[in-house]
Amino acid sequence: QSPIFGPQDVSSIEGNSVSITCYYPDTSVNRHTRKYWCRQGANGYCATLISSNGYLSKEYSGRASLINFPENSTFVINIAHLTQEDTGSYKCGLGTTNRGLFFDVSLEVSQVPEFPNDTHVYTKDIGRTVTIECRFKEGNAHSKKSLCKKRGEACEVVIDSTEYVDPSYKDRAILFMKGTSRDIFYVNISHLIPSDAGLYVCQAGEGPSADKNNADLQVLEPEPELLYKDLRSSVTFECDLGREVANDAKYLCRKNKETCDVIINTLGKRDPAFEGRILLTPRDDNGRFSVLITGLRKEDAGHYQCGAHSSGLPQEGWPVQAWQLFVNEESTIPNSRSVVKGVTGGSVAIVCPYNPKESSSLKYWCHWEADENGRCPVLVGTQALVQEGYEGRLALFDQPGSGAYTVILNQLTTQDSGFYWCLTDGDSRWRTTIELQVAEATKKPDLEVTPQNATAVIGETFTISCHYPCKFYSQEKYWCKWSNDGCHILPSHDEGARQSSVSCDQSSQIVSMTLNPVKKEDEGWYWCGVKEGQVYGETTAIYVAVEERTRGSPHINPTDANARAKDAPEEEAMESSVREDENKANLDPRLFADEREIQNAGDQAQENRASGNAGSAGGQSGSSK
């Protein structure tokens, strides 16, 4: 008895495809060893046709694949464009030779079945429309026309020219003639269902002088496309249902017994299990759309179907496309936190993993929005301007070679709660979803900046201090000047570092930053933060206003930007953010990254000079820890 199992007999017809699944015992050795498909010869030798090592024989070139699914302990051999020459005895097996563990499979490929003379074969997918062509002689031009379906010896009328329509074809069948043609009539049957398959006879006239045509209708349910994805990665279902349903609502559903549960549709329905990790994106005006799901879970594996119907729900007789999704638990994508918690006024540092082989790829961070189809406008990127409403409080820190980048968001409000995606313009599997939960703060923040009303005067010296608690004693403290392309670290002076850690005085742990002399371009947002190596921690932000001191004029503070940052609701900024993005509603963020890159290019030279000046404090010798 072989421990390998599969179909003993497989039968198909010429031109068709087969997908043969072989099951093997679930052991580590079996999961990783060579899988093969070979043809048994009369001499007892089994000639390899395809193997998981990459071998592909000449006769299978361009028409076969072998996919291993270690998570399911199966491998699948797909063979397309079958011919009668493919009929024979095969083995699917495991091992370095073709004598290892195997299972015998018999494949029989038949000719397309013979039908009565003059039978026209129509092959259509479920939900589509077939047009059956019926020829007749001039003598029957004014006679009754009909189409009937063979059921055993009987032939039951489907439709005729007296306007009779069988109830099961009501609103689906029409009989018509085109133009001035006097020798052909046509029957359209739309919204095809599996039970429509069979042999049809069309007839013009009655009795022995009647003209008859045979039509064989084959209605195919779409063969699911196999998708094999890693745990925590993402999958895109590309759905192309054709122009005839371009204006109907679209959906993606997951099969459950004989029903199909809608996951998302264009009418606003969305399964809560996919909240924050799904996007439906129309691709063009011809009804093409795609559905992207990120953060794949083991339970996401299954049989998916996309379709279209005005109700946004699956309906029999409407076109569909199908996929079988397998989720591999042996994932290359690291397990990262799926929920990050913060408090109002505080900050979060979110670590985004990416494919370490693609360290030069552009990194992005977007905010998933639960409009009807889901959308994810980019908030920040390695070469993307920070979105309006996030100035001074959002930055992306790339750590080339580490396989991760960090996104810091500070001055948190409860409105920041929601789902965010990490993505790159490289390997699309590496998209991760993070849920940010912001609760109301119950205590003072760990980092506090003084003075809070920060106004510097051009030409003078300006020092700003950041107070930190003893728990941050051993961490690296830094000041950075925020700009649209990140937060550039500045030289700073750590007052607390002079003390021994034993006698840490909670009140005197200070890291300060001095601007000397102050320049107009020093105006802007500054961050005080802590980090350990490449791991970023808490940050706080302050806006430094710069003004000219005119002789004799009183010193008046400008509008307090810091108070605005801490207290003001963000509706205004949000509104403008939405306005900017409304035309990009459902685009993959990568598609408009280039546009932001162009906007950003002009800012960089100026920013680099400014951050250099900001750190040119007189008599200061860089950062001390």
Partner: nanobody, 126 residues
Framework: QVQLVESGGGLVQAGGSLRLSCAAS????????MGWFRQAPGKEREFVTA??????????YYADSVKGRFTISGDNARNTVDLQMNSLKPEDTAVYYC?????????????????WGQGTLVTVSS
């Protein structure tokens, strides 16, 4: 809802033949799996054979214990499946269940079928 009704069970002598039928009423599918399982008195239910329709092709699976003796056939347009049992042995005595799965995927030997019939008794006397 899909209903499965088995027929054809009965008493037969060892070495004899029997043909079981299963009819599925309800929605028609062009892609699904139908199988036969059996349960002998005091034993676990076990896989016997299955037939899978997918993409215009037909796949037939058999347990080692029935290979060469039992043949599964079916008509997916009519939602019926038959089991021809030849060279019957006393150890084939069991209640035979018809099962249907509305997806062509998954191990046909598994219990993850969506619908099950009530069963028909096959007794093979020696």
């Amino acid at each position: 809802q899909v209903q499965l009704v088995e027929s054809g069970g009965g008493l037969v002598q060892a070495g004899g033949s029997l043909r079981l039928s299963c009819a599925a009423s309800g929605r028609a599918f062009s892609q699904y799996t139908m199988g036969w399982f059996r349960q002998a008195p005091g034993k676990e239910r076990e896989f016997v054979t299955a037939i899978r329709w997918s993409g215009g092709s037909i796949y037939k699976y058999y347990a080692d214990s029935v290979k060469g003796r039992f043949t599964i056939s079916g008509d997916n347009a009519r939602n019926t499946v038959d089991l021809q049992m030849n060279s019957l042995k006393p150890e084939d005595t069991a209640v035979y269940y018809c099962a249907a799965r509305m997806s062509p995927w998954g191990d046909p030997r598994g219990n993850e079928y969506d619908y099950w019939g009530q069963g028909t008794l096959v007794t093979v006397s020696s």
